[in-house]
């Protein structure tokens, strides 16, 4: 591994950059560490405020974590010649609050993108599609990691955060080849209708540690390749028949439902019956009731219809706001 800031082998590159020569294809940017053998560049925890312009053409894996990038403009990674090998880009924890349309254009091999732990007050609808055409060129992205990108309340613009993220996921139908999508820890209360229908290749979907209160309008029907669906640590109270049937109809799926505040009243009967016979839910023996009080901590699999009656009103603590 060579480092521009410490290795003598990089001195000529620094000199050539200073004399305004075009960047050499295999130089290492200042404040970064580079390994041509591993095709990897790491510019980590260096308080960078913009993406280095002189990235080596060989870069396949680029780590720009722990910086202070603030804004990713259109063409943030566009170079002449292009970074044609760049396949994995990690921008997590870099204090990004704005990702503009076309930020990832001209990266023809980009398969994995991690924007986690950035407080994104603005995510352009065209961040991943690159254009505002109703059908864009397919994105090469296969894995998109967007955990904990929710901004603090005072930085949210006057818009639904769920809607902003969804718009970027469906724009131009560019992400039809996406296999993995992580959206954990984003305070989502809901998924806008039809978002998943436009991501038909998904194999892994992580919605854990959100505040989802219902899946009634979420259609899983098109996700025939889905293998893992993570819904742990949400605010789900019951899954209704339509959802149960859709999940059961997915040939390969494993669903994770731990740590939701299940309401064990008469409306839970269908879900309990389904749980007892399905192989879809992982760790189903761990699912317990949260409400009503008299049912707290009862195991769902151990309930029968006589246990599931309807009291008129549930306590205010059931609410999610």
């Amino acid at each position: 591994t060579s480092s521009a800031s410490s290795s003598s082998s990089s001195a000529p590159f620094l000199a050539s950059a200073a004399s305004a020569q075009p960047p050499l294809p295999d130089q290492c940017p200042a404040l970064c560490e580079c390994s041509e053998a591993a095709r990897t560049v790491k510019c980590v925890n260096r308080n960078l405020t913009e993406v280095p312009t002189d990235l080596p053409l060989y870069v396949r894996n680029l780590f720009l974590t722990g910086n202070q990038l603030a804004v990713l403009p259109a063409g943030a990674f566009a170079r002449r010649p292009p970074l044609a090998e760049l396949a994995a880009l990690n921008l997590s924890g870099s204090r990004l609050d704005e990702v503009r349309g076309g930020a990832f254009e001209h990266l023809p091999s980009l398969r994995q993108l991690d924007l986690s732990h950035n407080p994104l007050a603005y995510l352009s609808p065209f961040a991943f599609s690159g254009s505002n055409a109703s059908i864009s060129a397919p994105s090469p992205l296969v894995e998109l990691i967007l955990n904990h990108i929710v901004p603090p309340d005072d930085k949210r613009q006057n818009r639904s955060f769920e809607g902003m993220v969804a718009a970027a996921l469906v724009a131009g139908r560019a992400l039809q080849g996406l296999h993995l999508l992580e959206l954990a820890s984003n305070h989502f209360l809901y998924l806008p209708r039809d978002v998943l229908a436009q991501l038909p290749s998904l194999r892994y979907l992580d919605l854990s540690n959100n505040s989802l209160v219902s899946l009634t309008y979420v259609s899983f029907r098109n996700l025939t390749h889905l293998e893992s669906l993570h819904l742990e640590d949400n605010a789900l109270k019951v899954l209704h028949n339509g959802t149960l049937a859709e999940l059961q109809g997915l040939p390969h799926v494993r669903v994770f439902l731990d740590n939701n505040p299940w309401v064990c009243d008469c409306h839970m009967a269908d879900m309990v019956t389904w749980l007892k016979q399905t192989g879809v839910v992982q760790g189903k023996d761990r699912l317990t009731c949260a409400f009503p009080e008299k049912m707290r901590n009862r195991v769902l699999l151990e309930l029968n219809s006589a246990d599931l009656d309807c009291d008129p009103i549930l306590p205010p603590s059931l609410q999610t706001s």
Partner: antibody, heavy 118, light 107 residues
Amino acid sequence: QVQLQQSGPEVVKPGASVKISCKASGYTFTDYYMNWVKQSRGKSLEWIGDINPNNGGTNYNQKFKGKATLTVDKSSSTAYMELRSLTSEDSAVYYCAKEGPPGAMDYWGQGTSVTVSS
Amino acid sequence: NIVMTQTPKFLLVSAGDRVTITCKASQSVSNHVAWYQQKPGQSPKLLIYYVSNRSIGVPDRFTGSGYGTDFTFTISTVQAEDLAVYFCQQVYSSPFTFGGGTRLEMK
């Protein structure tokens, strides 16, 4: 910012038809269902139906099937509702409303008054 | 169709009062309830969705609670600008239906 601009008031004769428009701006039109709601004078709200602008799929309140037809023009980001065989019972203010959280309507047009009178 | 029965129809209030409106669904609508405010001559405005979640920009004096068939909407401290008609709506099953409305008027 999100805006829904509806067409102006209509005064029509019984038996006639009318087509109301709702032009959307400030968001991606195809990303959200559009709802239509009726409010008769001094009365509550009645949901007529919704349309998915992405594919034109519709879902009607049975009460308004045959009365209302919902369509969209994606190229102009405009939703339309046609009301046919009008009677005095159809006199009302009609709203288009964008869906936000599923089912709930987070932005509304200013309303279009339809008066059926001979 | 699910019927949403909203009470009371009218409420006479003074500034600073606490106001509670209830809505009862004819069958369970889970947590799929929204509340709207309509001021005179204006379009309705979404205040609360999924029972208890405030829409963007809605003051925290507006709250909602309930589950299943019984729902409550509360204004903790009424202000003059809150004079309006308030509607509940179930979005659990089509056709989506509204309550009859509650008119808030100043004493």
